[in-house]
């Protein structure tokens, strides 16, 4: 054994000892901020974070002294590899501080962002509770639109300049760490090097995601078509039978999980409800009961109970007006055997399953607690997300719900209840896959520089239409930052983990169900009470990051790579049923339709042909003038023709589909109300009335400033002098 390796071991022992304490202090300060967002807690978190960062930077520099090629022991090698990654510490001190400030500010904006009554600024709605409640339950098109738009307008717009800076700094950090960009840095979590037969490259991840997505697409397209038909019933006249789905109608603020669409889409509504929310409320469940039931599930497969500290220190309900907390559910491994969950739990089936998910993280954290500090992590990020999801697959089954008294003992399973169950599962599991894939693809492209920042929103909604079949209910210009309206984006979390975890969870489920001696279709498997399944899972969990994930996966499922087959097998009966349901429907979507298309007017502008060498450049200022001119025309029309004083502003003239050869569409909304689109016929009358004023503003005429569908005015824009 080389002296280098022995020295490295000694160095790592010392590191592990010191890291434990500093990391704990930093984590604790972070917990305090997340559960109580105050200026003082931000400062404490930053101070503790700075100490941890300085320590890591120093240790990372020291770790460079041990060349990896001279280390034989895999455990030592993996630790050094991890420590030699410099993370943000490669940035200059001022840039590192700036990045920290940006991250904290984005987190605070997201968690404290609110929408307030313009007439009474004291009257506000936070995302949680309030806006999320609307997006989970409302069937009122305009209430949903108001919540959807307000959140993006209030929060997304504030985040935009910060996110632009964040991209630059994170890319700089990644490149200094020898990655192509920050997306590549994130993909590094899946990289395996130097383990014969188990290597996996960052590029391979992109390939695997792309090709598995192609395999999932047919199932998703049929789910999409079915959901579209049901949404047409719920929102008559708001949905196109061949178009994309309006983004604000999809079950939550982001259209990430479609779970809440179940009541609108349930195939066999006369059957007992397998969404057991009502039963939980009737039986007076609370947050504590939800987590205790989740704990029982894990214990039943031979995994450990939560620690006493977990129950004492976790924050499982919204502190309400007492203090402001980050309400997005998170699981915390603070170190020193201190495990906690932060969640503003509501008594719903959705949160019952989320509790299993979060507790899955804690089980993984507890299982690898014996590993060296630097190897205490999931084999890859997707594994960490998959653990609780495996449990949720069992916990959601009618069999399991019956066993814990949430479904009546006389609940009978048949083909119809099976389809109900699978559809509910698909709304959550299948519905989210294109969302996840598209979001991360967009970020990867942004980090790579493939989407210039003056086209972020344009490309976001193009991709959303093409890949997800979802359309923006109102157009968003480049002042918005819609991706950052999601927790994971504004809080700097990679996201492809939710895609990979979904494939892994079905691979794991298949293997664990075999261990549990389950017979019958995969979707009926409930692994609770199977210690064999629990042991098989635990053997993987305890490894943490000490083995390549490809090897860990192979140990459990017998294959080294992600595979979509088990997921497709699980949903096979539903897919067959959906194909039958959709036989008279259009499957797929046209990306041309939008909810505002009917009220839009197309404009074509020909500067060169009209002005020749005197042609000016069409830029943001010209567009501002155009929108102001239309707003003027609207004010004039309402005042002169309708005797109504309505103060239209340029922000009420909404432009979409701007093309470089200068054409675009626009429509007009009532002041301060994005959901109130002024009928196209009214806008046409207003433009006709002020046409010459608009033409003059741009030194153009009816032919060079063309409003398609609006008859040209009678006289030429500039009267020639009478001779």
């Amino acid at each position: 054994q080389s002296t280098i390796e022995e020295q490295a071991k000694t160095f790592l022992d010392k590191f592990n000892h010191e890291a434990e304490d500093l990391f704990y202090q930093s984590s604790l300060a972070s917990w305090n901020y997340n559960t109580n967002i105050t200026e003082e807690n931000v400062q404490n978190m930053n101070n503790a974070g700075d100490k941890w960062s300085a320590f890591l930077k120093e240790q990372s520099t020291l770790a460079q002294m041990y060349p990896l090629q001279e280390i034989q022991n895999l455990t030592v090698k993996l630790q050094l590899q991890a420590l030699q990654q410099n993370g943000s510490s490669v940035l200059s001190e001022d840039k590192s501080k700036r990045l920290n400030t940006i991250l904290n500010t984005m987190s605070t904006i997201y968690s404290t962002g609110k929408v307030c009554n313009p007439d009474n600024p004291q009257e506000c709605l936070l995302l949680e509770p309030g806006l999320n409640e609307i997006m989970a339950n409302s069937l009122d098109y305009n209430e949903r639109l108001w919540a959807w738009e307000s959140w993006r307008s209030e929060v997304g717009k504030q985040l935009r300049p910060l996110y632009e800076e964040y991209v630059v700094l994170k890319n700089e950090m990644a490149r200094a760490n020898h990655y192509e960009d920050y997306g590549d840095y994130w993909r590094g979590d899946y990289e395996v090097n130097g383990v014969d037969g188990y290597d996996y490259s960052r590029g391979q991840l992109i390939e695997d995601v792309e090709h598995t997505f192609e395999e999932i697409k047919p199932l998703y397209e049929h789910l999409h078509a079915y959901v579209r038909a049901k949404l047409m019933n719920a929102y008559p006249s708001y949905i196109s039978p061949i178009g994309c789905l309006p983004a604000h109608l999809l079950g939550d603020m982001w259209g990430r999980f479609w779970t809440n669409l179940y009541s609108l889409t349930v195939p066999f509504g006369q059957k007992p409800n397998i969404d057991v929310t009502d039963a939980m409320v009737d039986q007076a469940w609370d947050a504590q009961r939800i987590f205790k039931e989740a704990e029982k599930f894990f214990v039943s497969v031979g995994l450990p109970n939560m620690t006493q500290g977990f129950w004492e220190n976790s924050m499982l309900t919204d502190p309400g007006n007492v203090q402001k907390a980050v309400c997005h559910p998170t699981a915390w491994d603070l170190g020193k055997g201190d495990f906690r969950i932060l969640m503003c739990t509501k008594v719903t089936m959705d949160d019952f399953l989320t509790a299993h998910h979060e507790m899955g993280h804690i089980q993984y954290d507890m299982a690898y607690a014996a590993q060296p500090f630097l190897l205490r992590n999931g084999a890859n990020e997707g594994f960490h997300e998959a653990v609780g999801e495996i449990m949720s697959l069992s916990a959601a089954t009618p069999k399991h719900l019956k066993s814990i008294g949430l479904l009546s003992p006389d609940f009978q399973e048949d083909n119809e209840t099976e389809i109900n169950f699978l559809l509910k599962q698909a709304l959550t599991i299948v519905g989210t896959l294109p969302f996840t894939y598209m979001l991360e693809k967009w970020r990867w492209m942004v980090f790579k520089g493939e989407i210039p920042k003056d086209q972020w929103m344009k490309k976001w909604w193009e991709m959303k239409r093409e890949i997800v079949g979802v359309v923006e209910p109102v157009p968003h210009d480049e002042t918005y930052c819609d991706p950052a309206s999601l927790f994971h984006v504004s809080n700097d979390y990679s996201f492809i983990r939710y895609y990979t975890r979904t494939l892994y969870q079905f691979q794991f489920q298949e293997a664990l169900c075999q261990a549990a001696k389950h017979e019958g279709p995969l979707h009926k498997c409930d692994i609770s009470n199977s210690t064999e399944a629990g042991q098989k899972l635990f053997n993987m969990l305890r490894l943490g990051k000490s083995e390549p994930w490809t090897l860990a996966l192979e140990n459990v499922v017998g294959a080294k790579n992600m595979n979509v087959r088990p997921l497709l097998n699980y949903f096979e009966p539903l897919f067959t049923w959906l194909k039958d349901q959709n036989k008279n429907s259009f499957v797929g979507w046209s990306t041309d339709w939008s909810p505002y298309a009917d009220q839009s007017i197309k404009v074509r502008i020909s500067l060169k042909s009209a002005l020749g060498d005197k042609a000016y450049e069409w830029n943001d200022n010209e567009m501002y003038l155009f929108r102001s001119s239309v707003a003027y025309a609207m004010r004039q029309y309402f005042l002169k023709v309708k005797n109504q004083m309505i103060l239209f502003g340029e922000e009420d003239v909404r432009v979409a589909n701007l093309k470089p050869r200068i054409s675009f569409n626009f429509f007009v909304t009532a002041p301060k109300n994005v959901s109130d689109i002024i009928p196209r016929t009214e806008v046409e009358k207003a433009i006709r009335m002020s046409r010459s004023r608009i033409n003059d503003a741009f030194r153009l005429n009816d032919n060079s400033l063309e409003f398609l569908g609006i008859q040209p005015t009678l006289g030429p824009p500039n009267q020639p002098p009478v001779s």
């Epitope: 007439d119 309030g130 409640e133 069937l139 009122d140 209430e143 108001w146």
Partner: antibody, heavy 121, light 109 residues
């Protein structure tokens, strides 16, 4: 089918208190905002108060702010209106109404039959 | 709050006639946020029209709504005997207060 049944109305002296209840059935109660709307004898409709589906947001007309309190018990599918410091001008039929919305005040697609509150000495 | 003014206060027409009821807001109201209700003596109000022009479930096609900005109209194309009642317009915005018009009484001539 949706049903809303008000109770608790009656004769009360000025300055007195009364608590109205509205028992709901036929829909997922916690998923909708609810309101109280009143109608003085021979007069038009006046919105009084609203509460979001979870009970997290409450709204009041200026005329009752500080005197009336709206609340709900989702486990019992029941809406309440606690009326204190009652005045003669609070005399009206009080309707419980289901909103089409969840959090913001909305339209009212279902109404109860009303309960009469008379404030008189 | 926004004041809703209905006109006329009373409208006397015969069955088969066309009825046009008007509602004017003191400031601009989103057409997404205007409704009409019908109330018969001794009964609770009933939602007729929402979002200015959409008929509520079970409402006959003879009822229609239109308008934007500050001026809104409820039209009953051909009056049936059961249509004689009081009609109220209501504005809801995203924040309270909700306000109703004072009502138009539609009576048999």
């Amino acid at each position: 089918q949706v049903q809303l049944v008000e109770s608790g109305g009656g004769l009360v002296q000025p300055g007195g208190s009364l608590r109205l209840s509205c028992a709901a059935s036929g829909f997922t109660f916690s998923s909708y905002a609810m309101s109280w709307v009143r109608q003085a004898p021979g007069k038009g409709l006046e919105w009084v108060s609203a509460i979001s589906g979870s009970g997290g947001s409450t709204y009041y007309a200026d005329s009752v702010k500080g005197r009336f309190t709206i609340s709900r018990d989702n486990s019992k599918d029941t809406l309440y209106l606690q009326m204190n410091s009652l005045r003669a001008e609070d005399t009206a039929v009080y309707y419980c109404a289901k909103a089409t919305t969840v959090v913001t005040p909305g339209y009212f697609d279902y109404w109860g039959q009303g309960t009469l509150v008379t404030v008189s000495s | 709050g926004i004041v809703m003014t209905q006109s006329p206060a009373t409208l006397s027409l015969s069955p088969g006639d066309r009825a046009t009821l008007s509602c004017r807001a003191s400031q601009s109201v989103s057409s997404s946020y205007l409704a009409w209700y019908q109330q018969k003596p001794g009964q609770a109000p009933r939602l007729l029209i929402y979002d200015a022009s959409n008929r509520a479930t079970g409402i006959p096609a003879r009822f229609s709504g239109s308008g934007s900005g500050t001026d809104f109209t409820l039209t009953i194309s051909s009056l049936e005997p059961e249509d004689f009642a009081v009609y109220y317009c209501q504005q809801r915005s995203n924040w309270p207060p909700i306000t109703f018009g004072q009502g138009t009484k539609l009576e048999i001539k």
